[in-house]
């Protein structure tokens, strides 16, 4: 009921709590002197479902019979209309439309820690829409018994506050749990269990590890448990890693010994303990240790390449370049490279340490027969070194590969391609792909990039360092034992039509021709490798057509001859480039007028 | 037990506009109704608005259109956003929380329409 209501009530039979699909009577009656006055045969006693008008009635109380209902709490108002008025609220009354409560399922019951409180959890089954109540109950050996109730609408977890211990870990103790609400009840079957059973240990606490004479192989872990803890499982990876490796151990009482670690690398262990064989749950895994393990000495061996550059008729310059060892080959943070270079014959040596960079350059004489070998160190030894004989790579003409052509192959990506060399094919031991940003002044200061390909390969894809729109020196190096033979080609992994022309700086009249010289376009503005230049020219205000002449792209070629023009006519003359992706727009114009006789 | 506090309530002009809150302590009010009622002096105290636990709102025909109830089952709260109020709306207004163990009631807050 509303409240008591003093112009009349609401009652509602069998109940004001009833199950889903049962039927209820409403009855809704005017208390004496409450009706309209002067025309109690006037009443209108009008039933309303919420705010939705069900039934009316002339008198002093209305009958209503109700289906249907949905669960929940549905509010039903009586109002009385008179002549002339508005509608008064006479009474109201809720009907609260529910389900008896399921058996709960799945009961069960853990402690956590050996000092920890039992708790149970179980699966309530379908909403009640009723207020329902739970009560947990625990018996032991000799009779004792422990309740507990819940008071929460949702309820499916309680705690006992209690404390089993391992005096008798063999002896049973029985759960169960009973919902109750207005409809009805329903117990749970009983959980029966022993100490073993139902207590999780603590994960395990304050990790530590320890590498014995800063060695990966001499490893162990430490651990702290709870007293009764038999068995651990230990599981670790490294931190990069997603998989982990797993080890069960019994009876570690704290401590285990890993063989199977990397060095130089930050692994994460985790712990887990059991009290018992086949009874009982592990515990969670315990916090994360992270741990970086020793250094150990390098394995494995530096690729090394070089370059050799001309000085004068006594001296050359050799640049050594290398890369950098994988991390799983380096084991250890490297500290420096130790390059010897050794004149064979005379056995001169000198040797240097290099750190935070991985090239080095000299200069040695052109006489002799030189080698070099170059290490990598960590803090606990050195890699085995790479030697190499410097020799002139591309001496060898009979070994240069042939028909290497270069094609983009997709985003920053060139695919070389080559055919063996003429001499015997089978004498190639490796090939070499070097590749190097295009700089028309050769600069040797340009990094440079290198890969490795088997002899039975005739093709490679490159794809470090390589960015668009720009053009790279693509060199393929046939190696067999101390000579060598290459091929060069340009190559980009995307082009379009160069940005600018080239700037004329300079026209120079020689015997009745001219001299054109020009600005290299700046390489940002190439846009990919050039293929051809042209020279155009035509006599100043005429609007016939200018001649032109086609000259191919050669890196270091800045000038070029014209001898078509006629004496005392001025020409404008201007350049264009071309990539194979068109042409560009004009360079600067200028104008000439050849001073030399008629022919 | 439930206990439920009301706020929002005042002195506002015709026409004017109020927000009404009533807070419940006791996690069991998300699965029963929360309604409004209002009690003008002299007079008993008349529903005005319902919202169930699924958050279908209902009101008396003296509330439609002009009243909107809502609820945050989170906070445990209901709300009563009134426009258009009339000096006939003056009264305290209640908030309650039906159960089929019984009705739970705030202790009201006053509203009062006045020029």
């Known amino acids: 009921k509303i409240d008591a209501c003093k112009r009349g009530d609401v009652t509602v039979k069998p109940s004001h709590v009833i199950l889903l699909g049962s039927t209820v009577n409403i009855t809704c009656s005017l208390k004496p002197r409450q009706g309209c006055f002067h025309y109690s045969r006037r009443n209108k006693l009008i039933l309303y479902k919420f705010d939705r008008r069900i039934n009316f009635h002339h008198g002093h109380s209305l009958n209503s019979q109700v289906t249907g209902l949905p669960l929940g709490t549905t509010l039903f108002v009586c109002k009385l209309a008179c002549i002339n008025s508005d509608e008064i609220q006479i009474c109201g009354a809720e009907i609260f439309v529910g389900v008896a409560p399921e058996q709960p399922q799945n009961l069960s019951c853990i402690q956590k820690g050996e000092q920890g409180t039992v708790a149970c959890t179980w699966e309530r089954g379908r909403d009640t829409h009723l207020y329902t109540e739970y009560t947990l109950q625990l018996s032991g050996p000799k009779n004792l018994t422990w309740q507990k109730q819940c008071k929460d609408i949702y309820c499916d977890y309680l705690d006992f506050g209690i404390n089993l211990t391992p005096e008798s870990p063999e002896s049973n103790f029985t759960a169960k749990v009973t919902a109750v609400n207005s409809l009805g009840s329903s117990s749970s079957l009983p959980s029966t269990f022993t100490f073993l059973d139902i207590v999780r240990p603590l994960p395990p606490w304050d990790i530590r590890i320890k590498f014995q004479k800063a060695s990966v192989s001499r490893c162990t872990l430490y651990w702290r448990d709870e007293g009764l803890v038999l068995l651990n499982r230990l599981r670790y990876r490294p931190s990069n890693s997603r998989l982990w490796n797993m080890v069960n151990v019994t009876k570690a009482k704290g401590r285990h010994d890993l063989l199977d670690l990397k060095p130089f690398t930050e692994y994460e262990f985790q712990i887990s303990s059991k009290l018992h064989l086949y009874k009982g749950s592990w515990s969670d895994w315990s916090e994360s240790l992270r741990a970086q393990t020793p250094e150990e000495e390098p394995t494995g061996m530096l690729d090394v390449w070089y370059m050799k550059r001309h000085i004068d008729y006594s001296r050359q310059q050799i640049s050594l370049f290398w890369k950098n060892l994988s991390v799983s080959e380096a084991r250890g943070k490297i500290l420096h490279y130790q390059v010897t270079l050794q004149e064979l014959t005379g056995g001169k040596a000198m040797t240097q340490n290099i750190t935070g960079h991985t090239s080095w350059t000299t200069v040695i004489p052109r006489t002799g027969n030189w080698a070099v070998a170059v290490s990598a160190a960590n803090s606990k030894g050195s890699s085995l070194p790479t030697r190499i004989n410097i020799m002139n790579l591309c001496e060898a003409g009979l070994l240069a590969p042939r028909q290497v052509s270069a094609n983009s192959e997709g985003m920053d990506n060139i695919l070389v391609t080559w055919q063996p060399p003429r001499k015997d094919p089978s004498a190639v031991q490796e090939y070499v792909v070097e590749w190097r940003e295009l700089h028309p002044g050769g600069d040797t200061q340009v990094p440079l990039n290198w890969l490795r390909s088997r002899p039975y390969n005739v093709s490679a894809l490159i794809s470090e360092n390589i960015k668009s729109y720009i053009c790279y020196e693509i060199r393929v190096y046939a190696l067999s034992g101390d000579q060598g033979g290459c091929s060069s080609i340009l190559g980009n992994s995307k082009h379009k039509a160069p940005l600018s022309g080239p700037h004329i700086n300079a026209i120079t009249e020689e015997k009745g021709s001219i001299l054109i010289s020009w600005n290299s376009i700046p390489v940002q503005e190439q846009m990919g490798c050039l293929l051809h230049y042209r020279i155009y020219w035509k006599e100043r205000d005429s609007n016939s057509q200018p001649q032109l002449c086609e000259i191919p792209y050669r890196v270091s070629q800045n000038s070029h001859p014209i001898n078509s023009l006629q004496p005392r006519v001025t020409y404008v003359l201007w350049m264009t480039a071309l990539t194979a992706a068109g042409e560009s727009s004009h360079g600067n114009e200028r104008e000439f007028c050849l001073q030399g006789k008629a022919n | 037990q439930v206990q439920l506090q009301e706020s929002g309530g005042g002195l506002v002009q015709p026409g004017g506009s109020l927000r009404l809150s009533c807070t419940a302590s006791g996690s069991i009010v998300s699965i029963y109704n929360m309604d409004w009622y209002r009690q003008a002096p002299g007079n008993e105290r008349e529903w005005v608005a319902s919202?169930?636990?699924?958050?279908?709102?209902y009101y008396d025909g003296s509330a439609k259109g002009r009243f909107t109830i809502s609820r945050d089952n989170a906070k445990m709260t209901v709300y009563l956003q009134m426009n258009s109020l009339k000096p006939e709306d003056t009264a305290v207004y209640y908030c309650?929380?039906?159960?089929?163990?019984?009705?739970?009631w705030g202790q009201g807050t006053q509203v009062t329409v006045s020029s």
């Open positions: 919202i169930t636990s699924s958050g279908d709102p």
């Open positions: 309650k929380v039906p159960t089929e163990k019984g009705n739970y």
